[in-house]
Every structure is written in C-alpha cells, then in structure tokens.
Interface confidence: low
C-alpha cells in the first residue's frame, strides 16, 4: 500500500475508525447506565472526548447522544469513565438543571442532563 | 486480535474508515469542480451514495457538502462521476433551485444546487 | 411546516405572574430543544433560558432565575414560559424559538432556526 | 458570559450599495457566531451561522466571514427589503448571547 495510506485499528466489526479510535453511534434510546453498560459488553466504554484534533469528526456529528462524562458531587468535577478529570476548553458545559450526566451534542458541546432520561449514545474504544 | 474485531483500510492518513470505506471531510468552502479536483488529487472521488446499509454512519452527518452525483441535462438522469446512475429510492432528492449538482445533507437527502456555489465537500476512496 | 403558534397578548399588573404558551407542530417535538428570548421595545434580543422538551430539563440565564419557569406539556406538544413578580421593565414581546439540531438543510446546532411570532406582555399600573 | 458588540450602530445606505456589519466578541468564539435579520413587527430570521454558511432561502448578496473574535456580515448590494436590524449571536460559550444590534436604513 502506499506510504502515504494505512489500516486503521482494530475496532469491532463494522464500526467507524478514525485515528486509531473506534467509534460507533447507536440509535436505540437508553438511560445512560444502560448506555454505558451496553458500550461495556462490548469492550468498549461511553464516548470519552480527549483532543478537539484527535477526534475533530465529532464536529459533524448532529443530534444528542450520551458519553462517558458525569458530575462527581463529592467535589463537584466532572470526570469520564475512567476516573480522568475532564481538561479545560475542551467541552462547552451546558448545564441543563438537576442533571449529573452529559450528553455530547455536535461542535464539542456537553449538555448536563437528568441519568435517567433514555438518549442514543456513542461508544468508543481506543486501540493500543 | 480477537475475531470480532479487524482492520478497516488502507485509506489516505487520517481519513475515516468505516466498512472499508475511506471517508473524509473538508470543511473550507469550494465549488462543485474544485471539489472534484480537491479529491482526485486526492485518489478519492467525490462522495458517492451506493448503499444506506454500509453507509449508515451518512445519516449522523449535520450540515450539508458537495457529493459526487451531477445532472444529465440530455437525458434528465442523475449520474455519479464514474458514470453510473443513482439507484432509486438511495436518495430523496430535494431542488432548491436550479442546479446540476447535488449537495449531500443528513439523513440520505441529496439538495440541488448551482455548481458554482461554494460549499464544503466529502471526498471518498472505496478500498478494493 | 415546521410552526411555534405563541399564545396572544397580555396585560399584568406589577408584581403577578404570566404564562406564555408556544405550541409546536411540523417535527418531532420532543427532538428540539426551545429557547425564549425576550425584546423589550426599541432594545435588542436577550436570551432568557432553554428547555429540552424530552426530559423537561431546563437552564435559565443568570438574570431571570428564581422568577422564571419553563415547563412543557409533551401530549399538546407545547413549551411554556411563566414569569413572576413582573415589573415595568419586563414589558416586552417574548419569543419561542427552536434551536435547530442538524436535521433541516442549512441548519446547524444553537442557533434558532423557527421563530414564534412573539407575545407581547404589557405590566403596567 | 461573552460580550458581543456590534458597530455601527446604525448604518444608512441607499439600494445598490454595499453594506459591512462587524460583530465583536469579548473573547474568542472560533467561528459558532450566526446572524439575524429582524423586520419591524417580526420575529428574527436566521441568515448566517457557523460564522459563513447561508442558512435555507437566504440570498447569495449575504455572506459572513470572520473567526475567533472578529466577525463581518456583508451585503454586497442592498435591495429595498434588506432595509432592517441584523442581530449577531455566539454559541460557543454558555450562556449565547446576543449582540446590540445593527440598524440598516435607507438613506
């Protein structure tokens, strides 16, 4: 293949690859602990955003869907699934009221919603 | 790797791939032939809408691009640029005024446009 | 067509309450989020809060919260915004507006993309 | 929240000519600012947003350019109806705000 072309991944079977990330949209409505464990039982987790560069793809994307941020009370940050802070500049945070979940909305906005309101969601892995 | 996961490729550096297709989109603003030059240039082609089932991930797109599809004024038909004829029912084709190409926009929806008018464009390489 | 029908005028007396009603049609009502935006006379647009008409969730600006409440009723498919202890300088013609989510041409998320035809509210003595 | 101020205020102009509108954004907005035009007695229209996309049915004599906190809304020769006030908005810090306002009038 040519230098300047390359195989991206792995990923699941049909999911979309980009930089090295899998990703892939579902469009059944979940609740976002369902969201998350449907992303879990397939390896995957919640949509985790990490670079406006890296996953600039996510600009494109229309509607609302879940990802893996929520609100820590305790100390009122807001962390992903992983237990990683979410960096400054990265999301725009709309805080919808009495909400400790975010649903990723196009052009890295983050909508704080109620965890029990059914949503579609994004999944994502990322490869070694 | 485990069975359910694989490769997707080989595409240009940083392009999307999804179902071994190449995806990529371009978001300064040209018309309708620099943004067939700008993919050929490339070894893509303008977007080209051939299947709702392996280009599902075409439905989550916000906004709206130059794809591939151009009127035939002599005989009435739309045509892709390898030549081919659209498929029936791909694509609800939508005339916003008098055009000869075809704006891709979300949700299988293909908008008639003057060529001359500048839009951003999805440029696309199938993977053999 | 996509349509806000906003309910008619109306004249408070300072200190009461009004209920603007906005009721939607053309779409999937509870696949938009609403804004209200308010325009005193002869000033420009303020931005007054959002609701998500799925969940009922809401944001206020900072200026109205605590006397603003937007609520929604998903059977009629109708946003409502209720302001209380009005006072002269609320007098203004109050819009819907949906914010448009990607799935019209041209259109792109936050920006309002239907507009009601606004509802005056006069408070006056 | 992001302050957006407009000039000039008011700007007066006969059919034909060519109209610069400029938004200002207290900090930066990358390029998430649409423009509005509002009629006399009518709700706002959107006309531009992402900074330089036309939305739905709006005339090509409309176009936005602009990014970061700089932004300019041209119309490249004014026909009768385009006599109105043009509002700008920025949607990439909560909460959106609106501009003051610019005023075209028929000179």
């Known amino acids: 293949i040519p230098l300047t072309e390359s195989y991206c991944g792995p990923c699941p079977k049909n999911w979309i690859c980009y930089k090295n990330n899998c990703y892939q949209f579902f469009n059944e409505s979940k609740n976002w602990y369902e969201s998350q464990a449907s992303c879990m039982s397939q390896n995957a987790s919640l949509l985790k955003v990490y670079s406006k560069e890296d996953q600039d793809l996510l600009k494109l994307v229309k509607s609302y869907h879940w990802m893996g941020l929520v609100h820590i009370p305790t100390n009122g940050s807001w962390q992903w699934e992983d237990g990683s802070i979410l960096s400054p500049n990265l999301l725009t945070i709309i805080e919808m009221q009495k909400g400790d979940c975010a649903l990723y909305a196009s052009s890295f906005k983050g909508y704080i919603e109620n965890c029990s309101i059914p949503n579609t969601y994004i999944c994502m892995q990322r490869t070694v | 790797i485990p069975l359910t996961e694989s490769y997707c490729g080989p595409c240009p550096k940083n392009w999307i791939c999804y179902k071994n297709n190449c995806y990529q989109f371009f978001n300064e603003s040209k018309n309708w032939y620099e943004s067939q030059a700008s993919c050929m240039s490339q070894n893509a082609s303008l977007l080209k809408v051939y299947s709702k089932e392996d280009q599902d991930l075409l439905k989550l797109v916000k906004s709206y691009h130059w794809m591939g599809l151009v009127h035939i004024p002599t005989n009435g038909s739309w045509q892709w640029e390898d030549g081919s004829i659209l498929s029936p029912n791909l694509l609800t084709i939508i005339e916003m005024q008098k055009g000869d190409c075809a704006l891709y926009a979300s949700s299988f929806k293909g908008y008639i446009e003057n060529c001359s008018i500048p839009n951003t464009y999805i440029c696309m390489q199938r993977t053999v | 067509q996509v349509q806000l029908v906003q309910s008619g005028a109306e004249v408070k007396k300072p200190g009461a309450s009004v209920k603007v009603s906005c009721k939607a049609s053309g779409y999937t009502f509870t696949s938009y989020y609403m804004h209200w935006v308010r325009q005193a006379p002869g000033q420009g647009l303020e931005w007054m809060g959002i609701?998500?008409?799925?969940?009922?969730?809401?944001s206020y600006a900072q200026k109205f919260q605590g006397r603003v409440t937007m609520t929604r009723d998903t059977s009629t498919s109708t946003v409502y915004m209720e302001l209380s202890s009005l006072r002269s300088e609320d007098t203004a013609v109050y819009y819907c507006?949906?914010?448009?989510?990607?799935?019209?041409?041209?259109?792109?998320?936050?920006?309002?993309?239907?507009w009601g035809k606004g509802t005056t509210v006069t408070v006056s003595s | 929240e992001i302050v957006l101020t407009q000039s000039p205020a008011t700007l007066s102009l006969s059919p034909g000519e060519r109209a610069t509108l400029s938004c200002r954004a207290s900090?930066?907005?990358?390029?998430?600012l649409a423009w509005y035009q509002q009629k006399p007695g009518q709700a706002p229209r959107l006309l531009i947003y992402d900074a330089s996309n036309r939305a739905t049915g709006i005339p090509a004599r409309f176009s936005g350019s602009g990014s970061g906190t700089d932004f300019t809304l041209t119309i490249s020769s004014l026909e009768p109806e385009d006599f109105a006030v043009y509002y700008c908005?920025?949607?990439?810090?909560?909460?959106?705000?609106f501009g003051g306002g610019t005023k075209v009038e028929i000179k």
């Open positions: 908005q920025q949607s990439d810090n909560w909460p959106f705000t």
């Open positions: 507006a949906r914010e448009g989510a990607g799935f019209a041409y041209g259109m792109d998320y936050y920006y309002m993309d239907v």
């Open positions: 609701i998500n008409p799925s969940g009922g969730s809401t």
């Open positions: 900090q930066s907005v990358s390029s998430y």
